[in-house]
Each structure stands twice: as C-alpha cells, then as structure tokens.
Interface confidence: low
C-alpha cells in the first residue's frame, strides 16, 4: 500500500481542503472511525487500484486516525493497513468528543490503561488531574492517544489552555472490578516424617465456589493412586480444602507434592508445591561450628548457643562437669531451647553475671529414640588484670629492685617502663621500656603461677636496677585480652635522704 502524502502525522489548516490518495495491487479503501467516508475508487490501466479521499472545509472534528486498507483482504498474504493521523488545530474545539463508553474505564487487574482525552492541536500543553484536584499528575501524554499509565479507582479530567481560556474535558471514571482469582495454599502436618509415619497435606482455595483439585505426588508416578478428600470449611465462606493422606510412608514417598486447582468460569488456575522428606529413622545433626574453647568475662553475662536439626523433636540436656544443669532459682543460669523452624532448633545456655566457679567442661546433649548428639566445650572465665602490689627495696648488693605482682585470666603480659624527668612525665615525654634490651642497667625476672582454685594466673616480676643516680618513675603495666592495669612507684638513689 502506498499513501500520499505518507504521514504518519499531518497538521492541516482549518477550513482548508486536502486530498489523501492510497494505492495498491488490490482494491483499497479509506476508513475513518470504523466507517468508510465518501471516496473515489479507480483502477489504472497497469492494474493498480487507488482510492482518493477529499477532505473539504476541515474543522477540528476531522482530527484523528485515518486508515487505508485492502477492500477485500481474502487471498492476500498480509492484512496490510496504513495509518495516518491528522491534526486540524481549531480554537473552537476544545477536547475531541468521546463516546459515552469511553468515559468509563473498567479493568480486572492492575494494568496500564489510557484516558483518551485528545486535542486538535499537537502544540497544546495538556495536563491530567483528579476531578477534585488542581495538581497535575505526572503521567505521560501522547497527543494522538491521551494519558497512559496505571490509575487508581478515581475520577479524572484533562485540562488545556487555548488562547487565553482554560478548557476542561469530560470526566473519566476508572473502576477496578474484583474478579475472584484463584489463590492456593498448601501445607503439611509435617514436611519431615519417618518411614511408617503418616503424610497429611492440605490444599486450600479461598473465594471460589466451584473448583477442581488435582494432586501430583511421587507415589502417583509409580501408578499407586491415593484418593484425596475434599471438604468445605463451613465456618469460612468459600474456603474449599482438599486433603491428601498417605498412611505408613515409605522412603520412595519423598519428593514434591503439587496441588493444582482450576475453576472453569474464568478458566483460572493456580498451583502450589511442597517438599516432603521421608527419613529411614530420626536424626539429630549439629549445624555450624562451636569452638571447643569458649570464653566468658567475669561478672558479665554470656550466652552460649548451639544450633541443630532434629526429627522427631529431641530432649535437650546441658551438663557442667558431667552434672546436669537446670534453670537456677537464683537466676544465675537460664536454659532455653527454641524451635526456629519445623526441624531446626536453637539451644541456649545463659550465664548471668559469670563467676569464676562457672568455668569448666560444658556439654549439650540432644537426643530422642533414634539418635543423639553431644557437643562439648571448655568455658574459660576471663578475669581483667589487676596489679596487686608494686614495691621497691634495697638489697645489700647495692642494686635496687622493684617487684610487681598481679593476677588475671588469660595470662597477663607485663610491661615495665621508666621515666627520669618527673616534671615532664608521662605527659610530654614517653616512658622508656625496660627489661627488653641487652643493656646492663636493668635486669628482669618474671615468674608465672596458675592458681587452680581461682582459675587465674599470677605474675610476679622483679626489676633489678643496677644504678639509680636520680629519682626515677617506674611503672608496671599488666595487660591481657580483657583489660590492663598500671601502678607507679618512684625510686630514689641510695644517696638521697628521702623518698617520695
């Protein structure tokens, strides 16, 4: 098909006359608004068909779509159609009139629709508003079609300004109809069962009166059919339930169970699936790692957590040094085992304001008639270090010694430092580290003892100072993973008559 002029969009003057020509290899015809306007059809000597549409005394109402199509499309390979859009800017025509049914837009699902308000002039600015609102809505506008987007159930009008007057369109009403779609839910009494136990599944549909259920399941594939039971839940309107019950499950019953529901009125359907696992026997399985050495800080609370999978539900016991633990009435220990999913459990032992005596060997045991698992770890109580004693003495040898004693868990490190300029120490001058050099000035001797009952280390360190010629600030710092503590003593030379 050949259209002259080709378009696809033309802007014509009001009151003018315009000729449209369409030609093709078979009879052709012009269509306007599903009608065939008066036109001149001809057949040329070369066998070409044509149709001439003469538009006279054009007005804004001539704005719109024009189609050229084959008069009789039978026998042609393609149902070809050429579209042309003509604008006739006309200040006397505001918005092009709509048929009554175009003012009411019905939809059954959330989908894009078009509010078909059109003007005669492609240069005009058109805005969309809610019927009772002044704010222009941010919806794209196509001069040939209107506003397209997703709209709520409201009334809308279009506005434009022609010359100096504001023009409103008719109101458009958008209605969303509630067609009952199928919504299926499937659940099982248990998704994990032991062989010999029952599998029971339920498939529920809401909001429909007549539906058809179809189950697919592993047993069906081997030709062993199970007859489901369908019932209505009387206390809930339009709740229909199908129950699939397989007594004495076998290992081969593991797999996917699918409930497919159809309703014939609107030809809707939905399906949901659920996985069922049939196990040979029950199990208890630890999930994740728990280090075999755990730490808690003295006087702080500590929760020790073990995550495991089990079926059937297990009994969980906690032991300390082979003695069973229970929730203490004093609130010092709290035990809890939570079911976080059908087969997953979290067991927690909470020690409130941890005491040294709570260090030891802890075991969690989860068991049922088929299986058991134990998890053990050593709990170490970390105690912040403290310097218990820092003293200075003058042995007969002439050297001066400083002794530092402290305790903590884990084993504290000891750091000796000294400062000679008392006025500027330690704010301005950093102290000098002692005991880790090969200089003869100082000598260090450190002993470490582990006190079993208190479950902590004691560090005793003696610093020997060969020669002290002026007052010296000596600092002993103890450090471990949970803290540090420092004490300071001023060492004066033998010759000075006083000590600070």
């Amino acid at each position: 098909l050949v259209v002259t002029p080709p378009g696809p969009e033309l802007v014509l003057n009001v009151s003018s006359t315009f000729v449209l020509t369409c030609s093709g290899s078979a009879p052709v015809v012009w269509e306007r608004m599903s009608q065939e306007p008066p036109q001149e059809m001809a057949k040329a000597q070369d066998g070409t068909f044509s149709s001439v549409l003469t538009l006279t005394n054009l007005t804004g109402l001539d704005t719109g779509e024009y189609f050229c199509t084959h008069n009789d499309s039978r026998g042609l390979e393609t149902d070809e159609r050429k579209r042309l859009y003509i604008f006739v800017p006309d200040p006397t025509v505001g918005f092009l009139p709509n048929d009554a049914e175009e003012l009411f837009i019905f939809l059954t699902e959330i989908t894009e629709i078009t509010i078909p308000c059109r003007v005669t002039d492609p240069q005009l600015v058109v805005t969309l508003h809610e019927k009772k609102g002044d704010v222009a809505l941010p919806v794209p506008y196509d001069h040939q079609r209107g506003f397209s987007g997703i709209f709520e159930d409201r009334s809308y009008i279009c506005k434009t300004t022609i010359g100096d007057r504001e023009v409103d369109s008719d109101a458009y009403y958008v209605y969303r109809l509630q067609v009952s779609s199928i919504n299926v839910s499937v659940n099982a009494v248990q998704t994990v069962v032991r062989q010999g136990e029952n599998i029971t599944l339920m498939c529920i549909v809401i909001g429909n009166e007549v539906v058809n259920f179809e189950w697919t399941y592993p047993r069906k594939e081997s030709g062993r059919l199970v007859e489901p039971v369908t019932d209505f839940l009387l206390d809930m309107p339009y709740h229909i339930r199908s129950i699939l019950h397989i007594p004495s499950a076998e290992l081969e019953d593991s797999g996917t169970y699918t409930c497919n529901v159809t309703e014939s009125v609107n030809d809707h359907q939905d399906e949901k699936a659920i996985n069922i696992t049939v196990v040979e026997s029950g199990y208890v399985r630890l999930l994740g790692e728990v280090g075999t050495l755990q730490f808690a800080e003295l006087h702080r609370s500590r929760t020790l957590q073990v995550v495991f999978e089990a079926y059937p539900p297990p009994t969980v016991l906690w032991f300390k040094d082979n003695r069973t633990l229970g929730d203490s009435s004093a609130g010092e220990i709290a035990l809890s085992t939570r079911n976080v999913s059908e087969t997953r459990y979290v067991s927690e032992l909470t020690l409130v304001r941890v005491k040294v005596a709570e260090a030891g060997h802890y075991t969690m045991r989860a068991f049922h008639e088929d299986a058991e698992v134990q998890l053990s770890f050593q709990l170490q109580i970390n105690v912040p270090v403290r310097v218990l004693e820092l003293s200075e003495s003058h042995p007969d040898s002439g050297e001066q010694t400083v002794r530092c004693r402290g305790r903590g868990m884990p084993q504290p490190n000891i750091i000796w430092s000294a400062c000679r300029d008392l006025k500027r120490c330690p704010r301005e001058l950093p102290p000098t580290l002692l005991g880790n050099s090969s200089e003869e000035e100082s000598q260090l001797e450190t002993n470490v003892t582990y006190w079993e009952e208190e479950q902590e280390f004691e560090v005793v360190s003696t610093l020997r100072l060969q020669h002290v010629d002026r007052p010296l600030s000596v600092r002993c710092t103890l450090r471990n993973a949970v803290g540090q503590d420092t004490q300071e003593v001023i060492v004066v030379p033998h010759s000075l008559p006083f000590k600070v």
Epitope: R285, L286, E289, V290, G291, T292, L293, H361, T363, V373, Q374, L375, S376, F377, Q378
Partner: antibody
Framework: AVTLDESGGGLQTPGTALSLVCKAS????????MAWVRQAPGKGLEFVGE????????FYAPAVKGRATISRDNGQSTVRLQLNNLRAEDTAIYYC??????????????????WGHGTEVIVSS | LTQPSSVSANPGETVKITCSGS???YGWYQQKSPGSAPVTLI????QRPSNIPSRFSGSKSGSTGTLTITGVQAEDEAVYYC???????????FGAGTTLTVL
Amino acid sequence: AVTLDESGGGLQTPGTALSLVCKASGFTFSSFNMAWVRQAPGKGLEFVGEISNTAGSTFYAPAVKGRATISRDNGQSTVRLQLNNLRAEDTAIYYCAKAAGTCYSHSCTGYIDAWGHGTEVIVSS
Amino acid sequence: LTQPSSVSANPGETVKITCSGSSSSYGWYQQKSPGSAPVTLIYENNQRPSNIPSRFSGSKSGSTGTLTITGVQAEDEAVYYCGNADRSNSAGTFGAGTTLTVL
C-alpha cells in the same frame, strides 16, 4: 575466602629433620582443628596428623608416630609440622588442611573442608 | 577403609562409589590430578558444601558409605577418596582411592 599456604618443602637428607609451616587466613583460626595430609608419588592420600583448636590434643598416623610433632600458634594463625629422622618414604606432597567437626567428651569427629595447594618434600641422599 | 580401585561410566549415567569400614561418619574428596589440591565433596556422610554441584550426593547404610554422582560429566573424571572422621585414638584415615573414567 579460606586460604592455606604451606612453606618449608624442598630437598632433604635422610636422618635430618623437616619443618613445614602453614599460614591460614579467611576464617577464625582458633576455632578449628588443623591437619596435615601427604601424598607420595603415585600413591593415595595419607593422613599425617591433626591438632585440636586449642592445641590440647594431637593425633598422629602410625607411620609418623614418635617422629612427628604438630604445633600451632593461634595468635599468628600458623600450624607447624616437625618430622624428625626423615626417611625416603617420607617423600611426598604435604597438604595443610582445615578440619571441621565436633569434639565430644570421648573423641573428635572431623572432616577436611579446606585444603592448601601443597608443598613438595623430597628425601634423598 | 576399602573402596573399588576403578569405575567407569558414560556421560549422563549415574555412578556409585562405595567405602566400607567401621566409621560412624564418612567424607568424600575429589582429586583431578596427582599433586593437585583435593576438593571436599561430601562431609558427615551426606552433607554437601555450598560450592559443590548437586549431582554429587552421599549416603551411609550400616558401615558402608556411598558417593553417588548423578548424570556424570566429562569433568568428573578424577580420583575419589573416602575418609573417616573418627579421631578417638589416632589420626583419620583415607581409602586407597577410586579412579573414575568417563567414557
């Protein structure tokens, strides 16, 4: 990602001692047992030994018992295999391995869940 | 631990490799060439690490562990070792290895 880098392999003389070091990264080293596994030329995998996460327990294969010592430094995330009195049959690729699992009161069960690329040791005069 | 020395299969077939011993828990390891680092396929009889394809699965019946490869592929050609996980008295042990040939 878990990485295990072995070092210390090479040509060794029979009767001498071997020291292999494995540097670990990408996981909480102090929470996991570590193991050494070797593979002699043309042979299968052979467990050498394992050390518990706190270094409180070590387990050795019969072929190296009495000659092997596995130690670890949780601060540096390293594990060391010392093998004394080397023999020609100690020639192998030595793999450092991260062992996961659970220690129970009576024993440990573990499996290897990460492997190093291996370091080759040749014992020859 | 006892396992067959070799098995062969055509692409797409299912292969089962057994490992018999007295372990309560088996692991399975794949080594594609001698001297290359092994890869852990299965631990604790049937647990599969997240980076291992689902065609590898493990099971245990009685005292025998089984590694199953469903729909074998050319790249699965390798030596497969089973290992026990008991550490009560000595270090763990490995089977002698099974060579899988994909025809």
